[in-house]
C-alpha cells in the first residue's frame, strides 16, 4: 500500500462510519495509499439510497480521497410484500423492517389456509425477508377445498333444489353448449373433455360462471379462461374414455361461502367411493320434464358394481368395452336418479369422513340416450386414476 | 466498457402493461452497485422509477410502487421493466443507468421511445 | 424531495463563468450528482457527492454545496457546453431537478 512520494501530502486519517471497520489501518495515507469499509453483520454499504458491495477509496496527489466515505446503514428490508388472501402483522414493532425484524403472515380464516411455511419471517443481512426454512418468497394462502353447507350426503332421491353454499364449487361453463365444471384451487375448473373439445383452440370463448345457483341469473362471479388442457388420451366421437379437461382461469377467482374449490381425492378416497356408497352430481341440466334446469339441482345416488355396470353397456347400441377401468357407475337400477345432458363435466362428490371434506370421485361423462333409464347407468369419469395428470398441469401451468 | 441497451415495443394500449428490457455488457449486474430505470417525458423532465441491486433487491419510487416491477435474469445479465395499467402519461423515453453515487462511472442506455396510445 | 432548479435557461457567452443552481426541500448533505444532456442524447454524469468531478471531465466544472444549496460552475463556457444540466439527489430515493438550459446570449 505505501508508495512514498514526498512530494505529495497525505490524505486526510478516515474515520470509519458508526457500525464500519477501515482497513488497512495505517500511521498515515500518502499518494495511491487505499483503504476499504467494511460494515458489521446487518449492517450495509450505501452512499445515500445507492447500495454498495464494496467500498475502496484512493489517497490522490492533492491529499484527498477520490471518494467520500459511505454510510454503514443498518439493513432495511422494507415493507413486506401483501400476501394476496392474507395479511401481515409487525412483531418487532409497528412498521419496524430492519435487520433481524420479525413479521407475521396469516391467511384469511375459514376459506384459506397457509401452505409452504409458518408465516414467519425475519430481516436478514442479506436484505429480504426469509422465512425459517430458508424461503425468500412468500408463502402462498391456499383455499380451503371441499367445504359445504351441506353436512352428510342425504338419503337417495330425485332432484333437489340446492341451496346456498351447498355445491360452491359448481361451475357454469356457457360458450357452444351448456355444461359444467368444479372448481378447483383458485384458478382452474375441471371438467368433461366432451364439454370443452370445440373450444380447446379457443379457451377464450368459454363464458365461465360460478357463485351463482340460477342458471339464467344476472348475479354471478364471472370467469374467463386462459388455456383448455384436454386428456392427450381422449378421442372425440370414439368413446369417453379419459373424459376429463382442466381450464386455467385467467385470474384467481375470490373464495367465499358461495366459491369455494372442490378437493381432490386423497389416497384413501377409494374407501368412500365403495359400491352403494353415496356420491352426489349437482348441474342444471335436463330434469324429467325435458328442459334445462333453472335452479341448481342435486341427485344423491349409489355407486354402481362396475362389472353390473359394463354389463348394463355391453348390448347394443353400445360397442363393447364402452365402459373403462377409466370410469365409474352411479345410478338406480330401477332409474329415475341420474344426470343429464347440460349436466356434463360437473362433479360427482363425496364426503370424506376423517377430514370432513367433500371430494370430486367423478367427472359426469355419459349414459343412455333416456337420463334415469332403468337398468342404465349414468357414467362417470374417475378421477382418482387421474391425479398425476392433474397434479402435473397444475404444477407446469 | 460498459454498456447498457435497452429494447421492447414502442407503443402500448392504455391499461396494458409495458415491459422493457435492458442488456448489459461488459460488467456482471450482481458484482456491484443499483441497476435503474429512469423516464424522460416530453419536455426533459427526468423521473427515476426505481433499480434493482447487485444483491436483487429493489426500491422503487414511492409514486409508481403500486404499478411498477423491476426483476432480472443473471445468466443473461439483464434486468426488466414492468409497469402495469399504463395512461398516456406514461409516454416517455425509458433508460436503463447503472448509478453508483461516484463508486465507479455512471453508464447509461441510449433510451428508448414508448408511446401510449389506443 | 423536491429538487429545484429555478432558472429554467440561462444565457451566457463563450468564456463566460456561468453557475447553475439546485435547492433541494431537505437537506440532503453531499449526495447530489450533476449531469449534462444535449439534444437526442442520454444524460453524462459530471459531478458526484455535490464536489467531486468524474474522470475524464474537465476541469472547468466544479461542484459545491451540501445540505440544501448546491452549485453547479462552469468557468470558461466552451460552445460544446451548451446542453441542458441537471442536478440530481440520491440521499433519499432518488429524484432529479427540472433542469437548466445553457444557451449562447
Known amino acids: 500500500h505505501h508508495h512514498h512520494h514526498h512530494a505529495s501530502q497525505p490524505c486526510p486519517y478516515p474515520m470509519a462510519p458508526p457500525n464500519g471497520h477501515v482497513s488497512p489501518v495505517q500511521a498515515k495515507y500518502i499518494l495511491k495509499d487505499s483503504f476499504s469499509i467494511f460494515c458489521e453483520t446487518g449492517y450495509e454499504l450505501l452512499q445515500g439510497h445507492l447500495p454498495l458491495k464494496s467500498f475502496t477509496a484512493v489517497c490522490q496527489k492533492d491529499g484527498s480521497w477520490d471518494r467520500p466515505m459511505p454510510a454503514c446503514s443498518i439493513v432495511d428490508c422494507g415493507p413486506p410484500d401483501d400476501l394476496p388472501s392474507g395479511r401481515v402483522e409487525y412483531i418487532t414493532g409497528p412498521g419496524v423492517t430492519t435487520y433481524k425484524a420479525v413479521i407475521q403472515y396469516s391467511c384469511e380464516e375459514t376459506f384459506y389456509t397457509m401452505k409452504v411455511n409458518d408465516g414467519k419471517y425475519v430481516c436478514e443481512a442479506d436484505g429480504f425477508w426469509t422465512s425459517s426454512k430458508g424461503e425468500k418468497s412468500l408463502p402462498v394462502c391456499e383455499p380451503v377445498c371441499g367445504l359445504s353447507a351441506r353436512t352428510t350426503g342425504g338419503r337417495i332421491y330425485g332432484g333437489q333444489k340446492a341451496k346456498p353454499g351447498d355445491f360452491p364449487w359448481q361451475v357454469l361453463i356457457l360458450g357452444g353448449t351448456t355444461a359444467a365444471g368444479a372448481l378447483l384451487y383458485d384458478n382452474w375448473v375441471l371438467t368433461a373433455a366432451h364439454a370443452v373439445y370445440e373450444q380447446k383452440h379457443d379457451a377464450s370463448a368459454l363464458d365461465i360462471r360460478m357463485g351463482t345457483l340460477k342458471r339464467l341469473s344476472p348475479h354471478y362471479t364471472q370467469a374467463w379462461s386462459e388455456a383448455v388442457f384436454i386428456h392427450e388420451g381422449y378421442t372425440h366421437d370414439a368413446g369417453f374414455d379419459n373424459d376429463i379437461a382442466l381450464i386455467k382461469l385467467n385470474n384467481k377467482v375470490v373464495i367465499n361461502s358461495n366459491i369455494t374449490p372442490i378437493c381432490l381425492p386423497r389416497k384413501e378416497a377409494e374407501s368412500f367411493m365403495r359400491t352403494d356408497d353415496i356420491g352426489t352430481a349437482s348441474g342444471w341440466g335436463l330434469t324429467q320434464r325435458g328442459f334445462l334446469a333453472r335452479n341448481l339441482m342435486y341427485v344423491d345416488i349409489p355407486i354402481v358394481d362396475h362389472q353390473k355396470c359394463t354389463a348394463a353397456y355391453e348390448k347394443p347400441p353400445y360397442p363393447r368395452g364402452s365402459v373403462t377401468a377409466n370410469m365409474l357407475c352411479a345410478g338406480l337400477e330401477s332409474g329415475g336418479k341420474d344426470s343429464c345432458r347440460g349436466d356434463a363435466g360437473g362433479a360427482l362428490v363425496f364426503l370424506d369422513s376423517e377430514t370432513e371434506r367433500w371430494f370430486v370421485g367423478g367427472i359426469v361423462s355419459w349414459g343412455s340416450m333416456n337420463c334415469g333409464e332403468a337398468g342404465q347407468y349414468g357414467v362417470y369419469t374417475k378421477v382418482i386414476n387421474y391425479i398425476p395428470w392433474i397434479e402435473n398441469i397444475i404444477s407446469d401451468f | 466498457d460498459v454498456q447498457l441497451q435497452e429494447s421492447g415495443p414502442g407503443l402500448v394500449k392504455p391499461s396494458q402493461s409495458l415491459s422493457l428490457t435492458c442488456t448489459v455488457t461488459?460488467?456482471?449486474?450482481?458484482?456491484?452497485?443499483?441497476w435503474n430505470w429512469i423516464r424522460q417525458f416530453p419536455g426533459n423532465k427526468l423521473e427515476w422509477m426505481g433499480y434493482i441491486s447487485y444483491s436483487g433487491r429493489t426500491s422503487y419510487n414511492p409514486s409508481l410502487k403500486s404499478r411498477i416491477s423491476i426483476t432480472r435474469d443473471t445468466s443473461k445479465n439483464q434486468f426488466f421493466l414492468q409497469l402495469n395499467s399504463v395512461t398516456t402519461e406514461d409516454t416517455a423515453t425509458y433508460y436503463c443507468?447503472?448509478?453508483?453515487?461516484?463508486?465507479?462511472?455512471?453508464?447509461w442506455g441510449q433510451g428508448t421511445s414508448v408511446t401510449v396510445s389506443s | 424531495i423536491v429538487m429545484t432548479q429555478s432558472q429554467k435557461f440561462m444565457s451566457t457567452s463563450v468564456g463566460d463563468r456561468v453557475s447553475v443552481t439546485c435547492k433541494a426541500s431537505?437537506?440532503?448533505?453531499?449526495?447530489v450528482a450533476w449531469y449534462q444532456q444535449k439534444p437526442g442524447q442520454s444524460p453524462k454524469a459530471l459531478i458526484y457527492s455535490a464536489s467531486y468531478r468524474y474522470s475524464g471531465v474537465p476541469d472547468r466544472f466544479t461542484g459545491s454545496g451540501s445540505g440544501t444549496d448546491f452549485t453547479l460552475t462552469i468557468s470558461n463556457v466552451q460552445s460544446e457546453d451548451l446542453a441542458e444540466y441537471f442536478c440530481?439527489?440520491?440521499?433519499?430515493?432518488?429524484?432529479f431537478g427540472s433542469g437548466t438550459k445553457l444557451e449562447l446570449k
Open positions: 461488459g460488467y456482471s449486474i450482481t458484482s456491484d452497485y443499483a
Open positions: 431537505q437537506n440532503v448533505d453531499t449526495n
Open positions: 440530481l439527489q440520491y440521499n433519499s430515493y432518488l429524484t
Open positions: 443507468a447503472k448509478l453508483g453515487g461516484g463508486h465507479g462511472m455512471d453508464y
